[in-house]
């Protein structure tokens, strides 16, 4: 038994690090293998993480930490009962993929205007809180051209957008991540998708406006 | 519960010996780091010996290095401390105290035990 | 070794006032500091550690903050059951960790 593709982890930087590999052939990861890992200078006893199977020769493993701080390092050794197969380091500082926002919400009480709200995934004593920038998808459920991606670069979770930018009486869904310019990060997951009906149509005059000034094209 | 019980307190001449022990009770003991923390009388703390859990790994600050040892035996759920060529600033209460799952802080500690050095 | 310096070395203060303790090292140490709590005659009782984190148990009027160099703890509103000395650690490297000289908080 041996190891095809190291181990290689990220962190949500929060509570948990999920450590991927994958090995030389089918592999029973929950009963063959072990995922020992320890905070380097920690005196109590490594931590055990059993590896969940990922396809048939792949491996991955959730291992619970303690909040994060930027300085820490682990160790991290893969056995396979008494056999040491791969022995590594991980900084969870320097791997850091962000969890995914939450509770996206399209709000389209105002006629005119779309506003979408979602939650930080972190809690305010987290370092990330207020270190988050964000992307929001876009999509039309009847038309894959109609694609768009909107750069959230404050820290406010949420997004207006005119109702007009979209077209009228057909539906849409969203989505938004997050990452982190500060760690680096890579984008999180994408939130579960909202799905809502574009329902604008133009005043009267404004439509009326637009069409005679159309028209003199 | 976690419970750490400290003994082998007492008094003690300038140059002797001593023996401190800590059963340790309600948790893991063998998955747990250990230490003594001492305080000197109307003194602050100071950390005198660290093991680590399976005993692999001591420590000590310059003031203890070569004159005192920390122990365990994990069998018996037990720390110790041999404390040789004892001083009179070796004064002080004497608690053992777990480290933290997670962290090197201590979360639990004992009620204490008195070491006095004086002729 | 890290030399941790708390201030104030004592505090007057009365039930309900907000108390600030500071604790500052000589170093860098990140987030690996602990705060304890000890009463006359009575161990060490364990409440923040990671600088921030309060150990199970610990009511919410204590909070933890600061990180690389300058930390804090901070009792919001003291209630008589506080009134004790209080002592910062750090837990950053190998272990020669060391406490602060310890703060006491009395009664005005």
């Known amino acids: 038994m041996k190891v095809l593709q190291e181990p290689t982890c990220v962190s949500d930087y929060m509570s948990i690090s999920t450590c991927e590999w994958k090995m030389n052939g089918p592999t029973n990861c929950s009963t063959e293998l072990r995922l020992l890992y320890q905070l380097v200078f920690l005196l109590s006893e490594a931590h055990t993480c059993i590896p969940e199977n990922n396809g048939g020769a792949g491996c991955v493993c959730h291992l619970l930490m303690d909040d994060v701080v930027s300085a820490d390092n682990y160790t991290l050794d893969l056995w396979a009962g008494q056999q040491l197969l791969w022995k590594g380091s991980f900084k969870p500082s320097e791997h850091v993929k962000p969890r995914a926002p939450g509770n996206l919400t399209v709000h389209t009480n105002v006629s005119d205007t779309l506003l979408l709200t979602w939650s930080n995934p972190y809690p305010p004593d987290n370092y990330l809180y207020n270190h988050l920038t964000y992307a929001v998808n876009i999509w039309s459920e009847n038309d894959p051209a109609d694609f768009r991606i909107y750069n959230v670069t404050y820290l406010e979770p949420s997004l207006r957008i005119a109702a007009s930018t979209l077209k009228s009486g057909i539906s849409y869904r969203a989505r938004v991540r997050a990452w982190a310019q500060c760690y680096n990060t890579t984008w999180s997951e994408w939130s579960p998708s909202t799905k809502w009906h574009n329902s604008y149509r133009e005043p009267f005059e404004q439509h009326h406006h637009h069409h005679h000034h159309h028209h003199h094209h | 519960e976690v419970q750490l019980v400290e003994s082998g307190g007492g008094l003690v001449q300038p140059g002797g010996s001593l023996r401190l022990s800590c059963a340790a009770s309600?948790?893991?003991?063998?998955?747990?780091?250990m230490s003594w923390v001492r305080q000197a009388p109307g003194k602050g703390l100071v950390l005198v010996a660290t093991?680590?859990?399976?005993?692999?790994?001591?420590s000590y600050p310059d003031s203890v290095k070569g004159r005192f040892t920390i122990s365990r035996d994990n069998a018996k759920n037990t720390l110790y401390l041999q404390m040789n060529s004892l001083r009179a600033e070796d004064t002080a209460v004497y608690y053992c105290?777990?480290?933290?799952?997670?962290?090197?802080?201590?979360?639990?500690w004992g009620q204490g035990t008195l070491v006095t050095v004086s002729s | 070794d890290i030399q941790m310096t708390q201030s104030p070395s004592s505090l007057s203060a009365s039930v309900g006032d907000r108390v600030t303790i500071t604790c500052r090292t000589s170093?860098?140490?990140?987030?690996?500091l602990a705060w304890y709590q000890q009463k006359p005659g009575k161990a060490p009782k364990f409440l923040v550690y990671?600088?921030?984190t309060l150990a199970e148990g610990v009511p919410s009027r204590f909070s933890g903050s600061g990180s690389g160099t300058d930390f804090t703890l901070t009792i919001s509103s003291l209630q008589p059951e506080d009134f004790a000395t209080y002592y910062c650690?750090?837990?950053?490297?190998?272990?020669?960790?060391?406490f602060g000289q310890g703060t006491k908080v009395e009664i005005k």
């Open positions: 105290a777990r480290f933290f799952r997670f962290r090197n802080a201590m979360d639990y």
């Open positions: 309600g948790f893991t003991f063998s998955t747990y780091g």
């Open positions: 093991i680590n859990s399976n005993g692999g790994s001591t």
């Open positions: 170093e860098n140490i990140y987030s690996y």
């Open positions: 990671n600088a921030k």
């Open positions: 650690q750090h837990y950053y490297g190998p272990p020669t960790w060391t």
